[in-house]
């Protein structure tokens, strides 16, 4: 029986060119976390395996960093990074728990201010 719950950072926003930490936390279960997968939509970003450690998908190696903890850091954000992210906790014997985070990447405040306030 699955008794655990996933807590996530929910809906978050970050500036273009910046970085963001995606974090989830599994609570209310004594199940062993064997692996945590991070996905963007249906695309694998990274895996943190209890035994083997971190594996970052080759196509994201330049912009994804492991941690902190079981979280994931996205770097050099672009507006194309806007969307749903999923943390998938593989546990034994409970099964699989999934958490969802929505990230919105905004144009940087510098760019916004530059557009709004013209220097005479």
């Amino acid at each position: 029986m699955m008794t655990g719950t996933i807590e996530t950072t929910g809906n978050i926003s970050a500036e273009k060119g910046g970085s963001i930490i995606l974090q989830c936390h599994l609570s209310s279960t004594t199940a062993q976390v064997t692996q945590v997968n991070w996905e963007q939509q249906d695309q694998l970003l990274a895996i943190c395996n209890a035994d083997l450690g971190w594996h970052i998908s080759p196509s994201f190696k330049d912009r994804v960093a492991p941690g902190p903890g079981l979280g994931l850091t996205l770097q050099s954000l672009t507006v194309n990074d806007t969307g749903e992210y999923f943390c998938i906790y593989h546990t034994y014997p409970d099964g699989t728990y999934t958490g969802r985070i929505f990230l919105e990447v905004l144009e940087s405040s510098v760019a916004e201010h530059g557009a709004r306030f013209q220097i005479p």
Epitope: D42, I47, A50, H55
Partner: antibody, heavy 119, light 108 residues
């Protein structure tokens, strides 16, 4: 060449025991999770048990929990399956497989060893 | 356990035919679906991992698709060596893995 070679199968009476071995070669054994998958005669595939690369984590299908024990010796590049309290329904070909993070599937399989449980 | 249901259980086809095998999961497994080919008396062989990724060395006539609960394995032009049994397997509930019942592709 990457290879898995099972041994230890044979005929055993119900209630008896058997120990299967799987010798690995051609890859860094401790970097891979390993599993046992079985196939009863004329039937489909059934995952039986798995073990992490270090051997620190073990997992079992409900059908064998408490009767089978998976283990590995990374110094010998060998995977084991100790099968106790065997039943007729355990009759099958037992395959040893390797997985890298599971997400990528079971990419290497041994040739299998037949276990027959019969009186 | 996550139940995996394959259809059809068997099919007859001719060389050159386009063949489609489906696999349905009892709950959403996202894209955590692998396909294997098994020939009589031989061990299974990994064809496709994570729903649509072709395993190294597998001919491009094999392709996979799907997400959630419904998945498809397609052989674009059946070759003599493709007559075999095909199994789907979910890895969403890693480390507890389950297989579909298999689909036997026979010569018409």
């Amino acid at each position: 060449e990457v290879q898995l070679l099972e041994s230890g199968g044979g005929l055993v009476q119900p209630g008896g025991s058997l120990r299967l071995s799987c010798a690995a070669s051609g890859f860094m054994f401790s970097d891979y999770a390993m599993s046992w998958v079985r196939q009863a005669p004329g039937k489909g595939l059934e995952w039986v048990s798995g073990i992490s690369g270090s051997g620190g984590y073990t997992y079992y299908a409900d059908s064998v929990k408490g009767r089978f024990t998976i283990s590995r010796d990374n110094s010998k590049n060998t995977l084991y399956l100790q099968m106790n309290s065997l039943r007729a329904e355990d009759t099958a070909v037992y395959y040893c497989t390797r997985s890298w993070y599971y997400y990528y599937g079971m990419d290497v399989w041994g040739q299998g060893t037949l276990v027959t449980v019969s009186s | 356990d996550i139940q995996m249901t394959q259809s059809p259980s068997s099919l007859s086809a001719s060389v050159g035919d386009r063949v489609t095998i489906t696999c349905r999961a009892g709950q959403s497994i996202r894209s955590y679906l692998n396909w294997y080919q098994q020939k009589p008396g031989k061990a299974p062989k990994l064809l496709i991992y994570a729903s649509s990724n072709l395993q190294s060395g597998v001919p491009s006539r094999f392709s996979g698709s799907g997400s959630g609960t419904d998945f498809t394995l397609t052989i674009s032009s059946l070759q003599p060596e493709d007559f075999a049994t095909y199994y789907c397997q979910q890895s969403y509930s890693t480390p507890l893995l389950t297989f579909g019942g298999g689909t036997k592709v026979e010569i018409k």
